[in-house]
Structure formats: C-alpha cells, structure tokens
C-alpha cells in the first residue's frame, strides 16, 4: 500500500494510490468506500470515473492514466471509520533529459562491493511490454528486456544516473514509467586515514662522523606507501640509505609500518636540512620532518623537541 503521506510524482506517468486497509475492504465488500480530493479552494470533492477519463477506481486503488500537474492536492480514502490521507505533489517533467532530477533516488556503493540495479515494477508488471535501462540517458544493451539487471562488483566507472524505463499500454495508449538512481561509487570505507606516529617536527642530536637511524612509523592501509624524501635530486648521497619497510598487521586488519632512513658518516652537509617522511594514500599525503643538529648546538633548542 502507499503508506507515505507526502508523495512527489512526475507529470505524464501512470500513478496509483493504494490504501492500507485493503484486506479489510475485501472482508466488508458492502461497506461504502469513497475517494476524495481537496486542493486550494476546493473542499473534499468525491472522485469517480466520471470526474476524469484519466482516473480509474478499484477497491483498493486510485489510478491515474497518467497523472498531470493539476492532480496536485490532498487525497483521502474513507471507509466506515477508517480514513487515510496523502498529499500529492505533481512536478514538471524535464523535457531535456530522460529523467527528472527531483525524482532521483541516490545510492552510495563502495568500490569492489556488490552493486545491483534491477528494473522491476510489481504493480504494473502485467501491463509492461518492455523495459529499458539507461545510464546517463544512454541505453544499455542488456540481455533481458523484461527485467534488465546489472549485477557486478562496483568500479569507479560505474558511477552515474541509471534510469529504468517501463513501457506499457493501457486503453490503447502507450505510457512509460521512469525510476532513476544516482549511483555514487566511493572508496572502500573500511580504509583508514593513514597517520604518521609521533611529532611532525623532530630535531635529532648527532655527532659528526657517526651514524644515525631515523625511524618513521605510520598506521596505514595495505596499498598506502611510506617513503623518505632526502634531496636525492642533487645527486645521490652514498651515505644515505632507505632501509626495508617493516610491516605488522594490527588486530583491525590495518598495518603498522616502519621505514628507517640510515645516514652514515654524518657530515656538515647533513645538518640543518629537512629529511621528510611521507605516507601517501588515496586520500592524500601526510609528512613528518627530521632535522639533524650537532650535539654541541643542543642548548639553543628547547629540550622537548628532541628525539633520540
């Protein structure tokens, strides 16, 4: 039954209202059942097939063949002490598109997750001649032209507007009913925003001629990448080495990654320059920086900014 009290429909399409005490109505067939409409100045006007050639009344259903802009208003079904009310808003069809933007159902699907669109219309099923499925108003060539279906694992290319168009005949006239879905494909929402652990800026006290290991750790996703930037464009420094990344899986199925930058035989050229560790993900990048300072210069920098 049509339980929603507020309904928006597009002009020119078949439409129906079905009251929610239908089984009860069959039990007491002798009971008077009435449909009313009120709009603007007009108070309850009883509807009957003579009201309009576009209206059909059945026990449970009020049908429009098709619904038009002037059908906007409030509708009532009355039977004994049972009343049901709907507010109907009929909107203009978009003449320049295969669908009307205001009549679109939005769905978000995660990439790789199961994605399905099935073109079905149970109420008009027996009257439907054929059904077509369009993506962004271009017809998709699918095998089943009675109930076209898409069933697949979602890819980013699947994003778009999918319109099911049912073609049906009634009293010698051809009608169509359109149902459109706006499908948005999003990143796997189980992904985390990767985070580099520890302070963003680290001063490391070192001695010339000695070695130092700068450890960069992050919590990240399996496909994310962690790497060091250390000015290798100005000729590769043979004393600087990125070590092998180490990964440990967390109980949540994410990764704790660690990548060490090893600087051997520290020279003046290694002091007071930025060694940046970056984690890159589909959501962007995060960077933390290390600066090597001579132990003799430690007094110039507040103690809390040092790392070992």
């Amino acid at each position: 039954c049509t339980s929603r009290p507020h309904i928006t429909v597009v002009e020119g399409e078949p439409f129906y209202l079905k009251h929610c005490s239908c089984s009860l109505a069959h039990e007491i067939e002798t009971t008077t059942k009435s449909w009313y409409k009120s709009s603007g100045s007009q108070e309850h006007v009883e509807l009957n097939p003579r009201s309009s050639s576009r209206i059909a009344l059945h026990d449970c259903v009020l049908e429009f063949w098709p619904v038009e802009l002037n059908d906007t208003g409030s509708y009532f079904f009355q039977m004994k002490n049972y009343t049901q009310k709907w507010k109907l808003n009929v909107i203009r069809r978009n003449k320049h598109s295969c669908f009307t933007e205001r009549q679109v159902t939005s769905k978000i699907v995660e990439v790789k997750k199961f994605f399905q669109i099935t073109c079905e219309n149970s109420y008009y099923q027996t009257l439907v001649n054929s059904t077509s499925l369009y993506k962004n108003c271009k017809k998709l060539l699918l095998e089943n032209n009675k109930n076209p279906t898409i069933k697949k694992n979602a890819e980013f290319e699947d994003q778009g507007y999918y319109s099911c168009v049912h073609f049906l005949h009634h009293n010698g006239k051809l009608f169509n009913i359109t149902k459109t879905f706006n499908i948005t494909i999003v990143e796997d929402r189980s992904n985390i925003v990767p985070v580099l652990l520890g302070p963003k800026l680290n001063h490391v006290a070192v001695e010339l001629g000695k070695n130092v290991r700068l450890n960069c750790s992050a919590l990240l996703n399996e496909e994310d990448v962690i790497y060091w930037m250390f000015g290798e464009e100005n000729g590769s420094d043979p004393n600087i080495h990125e070590e092998k990344e180490m990964r440990i899986m967390t109980p949540e199925g994410k990764w704790h990654a660690s990548k060490v930058l090893r600087i051997e035989n520290i020279g003046e050229s290694n002091l007071n320059v930025l060694y940046n560790c970056t984690v890159a993900s589909t959501g962007g990048t995060d960077t933390k920086s290390f600066i090597l300072v001579r132990k003799a210069d430690m007094a110039d920098i507040p103690g809390h900014v040092f790392t070992r």
Epitope: E222, E223, V225, Y227, M229, M249, A280, T282
Partner: antibody, heavy 122, light 107 residues
C-alpha cells in the same frame, strides 16, 4: 584516446647511452606514478623504475640503479628513461606503464604502451 | 626474499576452472596484481591490487590472497584466455617485483 606511446629504442653498443620517451594522452598524466618495465627476448617481465606523479621520488631496480635515470615532464605529458653504460643484458622490449591508483607506487599498472625495442650489441 | 614464484606452466580444459598461484614474502604485506600477456602484445592488467577487475575484464577472472600466496582463478576458461600470466607486488624496498610468469594452455 587513452594511450602510451614509447619511442627511442634501437641498436646500441655496450657502454653507450640511449634515451627512451613515452608520450601519454587521454588521461591526467600528472596525477599518476609512471613505471618502466622491460622484457628480455623469451623472458618474463622485469620492473625497472618508478617515478612519483610530481617527479619528486624515484625508485630503481638493483639491476639498473646508478646507470638508468627516470624522469618526467608533466607539461609535455612525457616520461623518459635515460640509459647509460648499457650492457648486453639490458637488451629487451621496454614498456612504459601507468599506475592505476592516485597512490603513485602501486603494482597495479592499468595502461601499457606497445613497447620499444632496445638491442645492446657490439 | 622479495621474489615471487609462479608455476612455469599450467593447463586447463575448455570451460573448466583453473587456479594460478604466486608465492612470496612480500605478499604477506602488499597486494598482488595479475597481468595477462599474449604473444607479441603488451601486458594487460586483469586483477588490480585490491582484487578489483578493471573495465573490460570478464567476470570469470578473480583474485584471492592468503598468507604468502596470491591466486588468480579463471572460472570457465575460454580459448582466448590462453596466454602468459604474471603476478606482481610491491616490496619493502618500494620496488615492484614480478613473478616469473605462468604459461596457461587451454585444451
């Protein structure tokens, strides 16, 4: 049309140099990491090098490190591989390939060129 | 070791299911990708690093992973699936490594 077109291959003597180019079209070149992969005659695929989308980061296989340099010019939508000190074992078809993700370092390369042949022989 | 190991050759009857495997330590921490290469042609990505099929790849191709082993499964192999198949993954050195390749014959 989305495509990669390699050029610059040829026959070269051991110890000499060669520069390969890869012209990209049909996608936002500056948004992706780019790779060079080679295939010696009758052998499998061997990864050579990768460069980040902005060109700031590069990695090389151990077999070419110090001899080959990967670079890119995003204004020209072109990827390069400068090959110095060439050896007979560098003989192969060289493919450029595009990473499939906005994460520049990925093993999923979803667009490949047709390849250019490099023969190192005296 | 950062190497990826594949069986050199595998055969399958037309319409049957075949599984091509790839083993290596890097697969414990990084996704595997799979490529199809036919003679005289460039490789084509068939399964991406998140076990996703790129557009145009039939749904008979699927990927899975467990421990240090990645698998490519072709359900209902067709004659046109006869090709060399390569696995690949990143490793801890931020390099990409390829497996040695598997030659698939469809009987």
């Amino acid at each position: 049309e989305v495509q990669l077109v390699e050029s610059g291959g040829g026959v070269v003597q051991p110890g000499r140099s060669l520069r390969l180019s890869c012209a990209a079209s049909g996608f936002t070149f500056s948004g992706y990491g780019m790779h060079w992969v080679r295939q010696a005659p009758g052998k499998g695929l061997e990864w050579v090098a990768v460069i980040s989308n902005d060109g700031s980061k590069k990695y090389y296989s151990d077999s070419v490190k110090g001899r080959f340099t990967i670079s890119r010019d995003n204004s020209k939508n072109t990827l390069y591989l400068q090959m110095n000190s060439l050896r007979a074992e560098d003989t192969a078809v060289y493919y450029c390939a595009k990473g499939s993700s906005s994460i520049w370092l990925t093993s999923a390369l979803n667009l490949w060129g047709q390849g250019t042949t490099v023969t190192v022989s005296s | 070791s950062s190497e990826l190991t594949q069986d050199p050759a595998v055969s399958v009857a037309l319409g049957q299911t075949v599984r091509i495997t790839c083993q290596g330590d890097s697969l414990r921490s990084y996704y595997a990708s799979w490529y199809q290469q036919k003679p005289g042609q460039a490789p084509v990505l068939v399964i991406s690093a998140k076990n996703n099929r790129p557009s145009g790849i039939p749904d008979r191709f699927s990927g899975s992973s467990s421990g240090n082993t990645a698998s490519l499964t072709i359900t209902g192999a067709q004659a046109e699936d006869e090709a060399d198949y390569y696995c690949a993954s990143r490793n801890g050195w931020n390099h990409v490594v390829f497996g040695g390749g598997t030659k698939l014959t469809v009987l």
